[in-house]
């Protein structure tokens, strides 16, 4: 199916131009989305182009400024947050990035009633995390790894924890591995629905081995960055969950929530916390061997001022074919009775679907079913459940929003988005106001992205929030590549692929082929989304065919494909890329002497292994920030898929699946290896070991390091990186500069 039809006609050809690398590096064709900052059922805030904070009222159709750009500028604020009682706004400035989600900042509290900043008992700086209570204007914040509470912004703080210590004890914020691989947030504290209680995690990293790397900076001596980072098989953080009554915090102090006995018997993780009511909380735990997850519902005992987690309220989720969940174990969405909930997990046929759990998981009622997957539950109201799935027309790389009426029997299902803008929009997400009175739909493609506002009862479109008109106009004279999403059936495996073809593509001609690969467990590369990026340029200007293939281990097509790679990373992902390349050659328009592969992170690992597969298919390839041995990567991620690197578990495959073990096989390919020296995620160590193995095997290769750059290679490094990779590929494919 052709997703982005070419607008090229002979009469227009003279005025049309190809994409340039400069276009990509300048972000000329980037798009905007609009996510309302909901503050009620019918109101949202949005930061206007001139930086005013504006309140929009959907029902009146009116808007007004609640915070002027003058106020924002007075403290150089880049972000804001309105207190639920609408009396105060926090203004965030001096943003300083730490890891993927975490950052520190300076916070100022502005009183909307009097138009002045709150003076007296100002917040310390820099703060690691700050948030309002869900009701009123209490503040919780983390400073120097300790949690503080303010009843009102101008009040003195109450210190909740005292043991916080850099790189040792983390309160209310995750350590490196929990941030990156488990919580995927910068915070580890959660207010109860009405702000009565505050739950928080304490992470003890005292015994975790430390990764140390040089940060060169501008000084005479480099700094050493030290991060407690558990690699596969290493000592893990010790986690504890506490809850404190924020009304009388000094009364009994923080109370620890007990860990289920079957979890506490060996190493374990805390995976998420969901408040149900002010006096009921749901915690999810996971064994270190991540095929057993326990969901535990705990109740506040007024008499003892403690939290009780009866065994009858423990729900076990176990996988016998792989790990528990998809990338993460899914979180529950509770219904109005405050005990039953909706949750996505594998059904008996091995597809992830929504289930309704009333008493036990064994008695769960399956809500969705089919050879497709439910992906996210957005909202449950009294009468509707909104979710996304890839059911429509059997394309795994699409996302549509559905509504199931749970108030009526039998429940009826309606696709809210399937037929809205069918050609333009096949990949949606949604954002709901209180009680799902209204919602915003954000369409990511395959056409130009568009964000729209809808009535939560009728699903009627109310208005367009962002339609990227400027982008549409800018693209009018650009020769964009054609894109198609199709599938290959090979040995009972379905391999979906996206092919990006030059604008004047002619099947009778031969083109160089570049495979772009990620291929990590539970990932998906073949998606019906809009993008004008580096590979668009390579197709448009340099005449390459680019292909992305979702092989075994990828997501949203059932457990058989997903769990195929369990305990065997680096085997089937590579095989499936190679199989796809052979199929592409059979199509007749690929120049088999000019085939390359490239990838970043997990994709760098797969591209390296593919180049070293000994097939002779690839002339050249690039690995950016690759993993080279699973012994070098984080415990939480690696062990989920590989088990432990011990003799009695899976050490053999850990050793067999390294890039270094295949050093000899790089002799007949051109290899470009790239890594940032300050990569906190996939450590530079990975590429250092590849380089050492290649040198020891006397294999020639090319390399580029980016000093003081992390896993994202951002800023000026990005420009240098893509320019460098472009030169490498053009040389490999004998394309003139």
């Amino acid at each position: 199916i052709v997703l982005r039809p070419s607008r090229v006609h002979n009469s227009e050809e003279n005025t049309m131009r190809a994409l340039t690398l400069k276009d990509i590096l300048n972000g000329t064709f980037s798009y905007k989305t609009f996510f309302p900052n909901w503050i009620s059922g019918q109101e949202y805030l949005h930061q206007s182009a001139d930086n005013n904070i504006v309140l929009y009222n959907i029902e009146t159709g009116q808007s007004y400024t609640i915070l002027s750009n003058r106020t924002m500028k007075s403290v150089n604020a880049s972000n804001y947050g309105l207190s639920p009682d609408r009396q105060f706004v926090y203004l965030e400035s001096d943003y300083s990035k730490l890891w993927r989600y975490s950052y520190t900042a300076t916070y100022y509290i502005y009183d909307l009633s009097n138009g002045e900043f709150v003076r007296g008992n100002e917040l310390p700086r820099p703060i690691q995390y700050l948030c309002w209570s869900p009701v009123g204007s209490k503040l919780a914040y983390v400073y120097q790894n300790n949690i503080y509470l303010k009843q009102r912004p101008g009040d003195p703080p109450f210190q909740i924890t005292f043991n916080g210590r850099e790189n040792k004890i983390f309160n209310g914020i995750p350590d490196w591995v929990y941030e990156e691989e488990m919580l995927a947030t910068k915070y580890a504290l959660w207010w109860s629905p009405n702000g009565k209680f505050l739950a928080y995690a304490e992470f003890n990293d005292t015994d975790i081995p430390v990764i140390a790397y040089s940060y060169y900076g501008d000084e005479q001596y480099p700094r050493t960055i030290n991060i407690p980072y558990p690699k596969a098989g290493a000592k893990n953080p010790v986690v504890r969950i506490f809850i404190i009554d924020t009304t009388y915090p000094a009364y009994v102090g923080p109370q620890e929530v007990p860990v289920p006995a079957m979890i506490a018997s060996s190493d374990y993780y805390f995976s998420w916390l969901t408040w149900v009511t002010d006096e009921r909380v749901c915690l999810q735990w996971l064994k270190r061997v991540q095929n057993v997850s326990v969901l535990s519902i705990c109740d506040f005992r007024e008499d003892w001022q403690t939290w009780d987690c009866p065994k009858t309220q423990e729900h076990i989720e176990e996988s016998r074919t792989g790990w528990a969940g998809g990338f993460f174990v899914s979180t529950p969405v509770f219904s109005y009775d405050a005990i039953s909930y909706y949750k996505i997990f594998s059904d008996k046929d091995g597809y992830k679907h929504i289930h309704y759990i009333k008493d036990t998981v064994e008695n769960a009622i399956q809500i969705t079913s089919g050879k497709w997957e439910a992906i996210n539950i957005f909202r449950v109201t009294q009468d509707s459940l909104f979710y996304s799935s890839n059911e429509f027309e059997e394309y795994p790389g699409r996302r549509n929003i559905y509504r199931i009426s749970i108030g009526s029997y039998p429940p009826s299902k309606k696709c809210v988005t399937c037929h809205l803008r069918k050609e333009r929009c096949q990949y949606y997400t949604a954002s709901f106001s209180d009680y799902a009175k209204y919602y915003a739909l954000v369409c990511y493609g395959p056409g130009i992205p568009i964000s729209t506002l809808h009535d939560g009862r009728t699903d009627q479109e109310i208005k367009i929030l962002e339609e990227n008109k400027e982008l549409e106009n800018a693209l009018k004279n650009i020769q964009l590549p054609k894109e198609e999403i199709k599938k290959l059936e090979v040995d009972e495996i379905t391999l979906w692929y996206k092919m990006i073809l030059p604008p004047q593509f002619d099947r009778s001609k031969k083109y160089p082929l570049l495979i772009q690969v990620y291929g990590g467990p539970c990932s998906q590369s073949v998606r019906s989304v809009f993008a004008v990026n580096w590979i668009s340029y390579l197709a448009s200007k340099e005449g390459m065919v680019i292909a992305l293939v979702d092989g075994r281990g990828t997501a949203f097509q059932g457990d058989k494909l997903l769990y195929a790679v369990y305990r065997k990373l680096g085997v089937y992902e590579v095989e499936d890329q190679i199989t796809a390349v052979r199929k592409f050659i059979e199509m007749g328009f690929i120049d088999e002497k000019r085939i390359a592969i490239w990838g970043w992170s997990y994709g760098g690992y797969v591209s390296s292994l593919a180049l070293a597969s000994g097939t002779g298919l690839f002339k050249c390839g690039i690995a950016v920030a690759p993993v080279s041995s699973w012994e070098y990567y984080a415990s939480v991620y690696t062990e989920r898929f590989m088990g432990l690197p011990t003799k009695d578990d899976n050490l053999e495959h850990y050793k067999n699946s390294t890039v270094m073990a295949r050093a000899e096989y790089f002799r007949n390919v051109d290899y470009l290896l790239i890594h940032g020296t300050a990569d906190d995620n996939v450590h530079f160590q990975n590429s250092a070991q590849i380089a050492k193995a290649l040198v020891n095997a006397q294999v020639d290769f090319q390399a580029m390091w980016y000093s003081d750059q992390n896993h994202g290679l951002s800023g000026l490094s990005t420009n240098h990186l893509y320019t460098h990779m472009t030169h490498f590929l053009k040389q490999c494919f004998s394309l003139s500069d």
Epitope: S40, T60, Y64, T65, G115
Partner: nanobody
Framework: QVQLQESGGGLVQAGGSLRLSCVVS????????MGWYRQAPGKRRELVAS???????NYADSVKGRFTISRDNAKSTVFLQMNSLKPEDTAVYYC????????????TYWGTQVTVSS
Amino acid sequence: QVQLQESGGGLVQAGGSLRLSCVVSGTILSSNSMGWYRQAPGKRRELVASISTDGSTNYADSVKGRFTISRDNAKSTVFLQMNSLKPEDTAVYYCNFHPPVVRDWGDTYWGTQVTVSS
């Protein structure tokens, strides 16, 4: 054009009562959260009471138990019933959206003067 017109202020003795009214035009009152604010001479403006679209209310600590905010959506009017008035309640009382519209208050809103004598 949205307009807010306050009335009901006046001079009253300590312990007395007043009922302030705010007629809202140019918008749908029922869809807006509203607030009563006040500013005493030489003091900062402060929120006295607010009422959300679902009718839930919020009060400044200094007026809790004495003042009551309410609304009559049919009449597009927001009220502030003030009982057991104290001299420190003396101020100009303004009606506004909640959170308030950012404007120069003096220019836009006349307010209504409440003076409590001892």
